[in-house]
Interface confidence: low
């Protein structure tokens, strides 16, 4: 999906209002120094591409992210403010429906969520630079 035509201001507002809080809740109990932040993005569409990949792409190391509250809100936000995004996600949604409920947050997901926080912060920074 090409994120070029998204309403970045609205996405930023949704992130600051709800998604960020859910991400931070997920990371509670870990120190900000626990994980090196390495994932980067160069502009707003690129940041959203990376955010989508780390939030929704399947990884055997970390099974449960797509079912987390922050992931659901991210999906809703992208569907709302990125034209045509929801259509591209139908197959992904069907695949996730097959997923069984995971019970525990393993620390192997924490690295990924830590990177997500970094990507969102980068997204906000690139937004501020453009204004």
């Amino acid at each position: 999906y090409d994120f070029t035509n998204c309403d970045f201001q609205k996405i930023e507002a949704d992130y600051l209002r709800t998604i960020s809080k859910d991400l931070i809740t997920y990371m509670s109990g870990t120190k900000s120094t626990d994980f090196n932040n390495t994932v980067s993005c160069s502009n707003r569409p690129h940041c959203l591409t990376e955010i989508q990949s780390l939030t929704f792409n399947p990884t055997p190391r970390c099974a449960s992210l797509a079912k987390e509250m922050f992931a659901r809100k991210t999906k809703a936000t992208l569907a709302l403010w990125c034209p045509g995004y929801s259509e591209t996600q139908i197959n992904a949604t069907q695949a996730m429906k097959k997923a069984r409920k995971s019970k525990v947050t393993t620390n192997k997901c924490l690295e990924q969520v830590s990177q997500l926080l970094g990507l969102w912060r980068r997204f906000i920074r690139t937004l501020l630079k453009k204004q």
Partner: antibody, heavy 121, light 112 residues
Framework: EVQLVESGGGLVQPGGSLRLSCAAS????????MTWVRQAPGKGLEWVSS????????YYADSVKGRFTISRDNAKNSLSLQMNSLRAEDTAVYYC??????????????WGQGVLVTVSS | DIVMTQTPLSLSVTPGEPASISCRSS???????????LHWYLQKPGQSPQLLIY???HRASGVPDRFSGSGSDTDFTLKISRVEAEDVGVYYC?????????FGGGTKVEIK
């Protein structure tokens, strides 16, 4: 162009050491897990080691555990494999590959040209 | 550890004819997240391997649509609908469900 270029191979005596390097270009290196795969002459592919994008998690095949060390320098877009206590059975072409993480389901979607390591007296 | 077994060991195919390679895992490759961690690679003579299919059935970028993957749990198949001369090489399946990741022994495809 997305590219991985390995270096550091060569002939080494049993018990010796060698350090393989992999230079990445054409993509945001720090966003990807990286993996070393090897192929003994005339044989199939064998997974050696993987490292996550932030180096938080590192995995080794039992055959190299305790002897090989994988590391990465995201600032320099480079991946390394330090190989100690080398044995004849470590003789192989070593491939640097991109993947093992959230992209393409952990598959290895980019491969280097490979570098030959020969362990012989 | 998960053991991957490929059959046949080698395959001789007439150009334009279909070909099929089987890969079996010693345990299910279905993850709790609903995805199945089975991938296919092709190593052409004198070249590095290249990704063909990931997550059972998704074609990698630039891979012709004559290649298709199918299967579930422990049994998987790579099909080439019409073999071309450039398809010769060794085909490998790989599981990335759990470490140690493992490859099948390979299937050598040649042209008759």
């Amino acid at each position: 162009e997305v590219q991985l270029v390995e270096s550091g191979g060569g002939l080494v005596q049993p018990g010796g050491s060698l350090r393989l390097s992999c230079a990445a270009s054409g993509f945001t290196f720090s966003n990807y897990d990286m993996t070393w795969v090897r192929q003994a002459p005339g044989k199939g592919l064998e997974w050696v080691s993987s490292i996550t994008f932030a180096s938080s998690y590192i995995y080794y095949a039992d055959s190299v555990k305790g002897r090989f060390t994988i590391s990465r320098d995201n600032a320099k877009n480079s991946l390394s494999l330090q190989m100690n206590s080398l044995r004849a059975e470590d003789t192989a072409v070593y491939y640097c590959t991109r993947g093992g993480g959230a992209y393409h389901g952990g598959s290895l979607d980019v491969w280097g040209q490979g570098v030959l390591v020969t362990v012989s007296s | 550890d998960i053991v991957m077994t490929q059959t046949p060991l080698s395959l001789s195919v007439t150009p334009g004819e279909p070909a099929s390679i089987s890969c079996r895992s010693s345990q299910s490759l279905l993850h709790i997240n609903g995805y199945t961690y089975l991938h296919w690679y092709l190593q052409k003579p004198g070249q590095s391997p290249q990704l063909l299919i990931y997550l059972v059935s998704h074609r990698a970028s630039g891979v012709p649509d004559r290649f298709s993957g199918s299967g579930s749990d422990t049994d998987f198949t790579l099909k080439i609908s019409r073999v071309e001369a450039e398809d010769v090489g060794v085909y490998y399946c790989e599981q990335t469900l759990q470490t140690p990741y493992s490859f099948g022994g390979g299937t050598k495809v040649e042209i008759k």
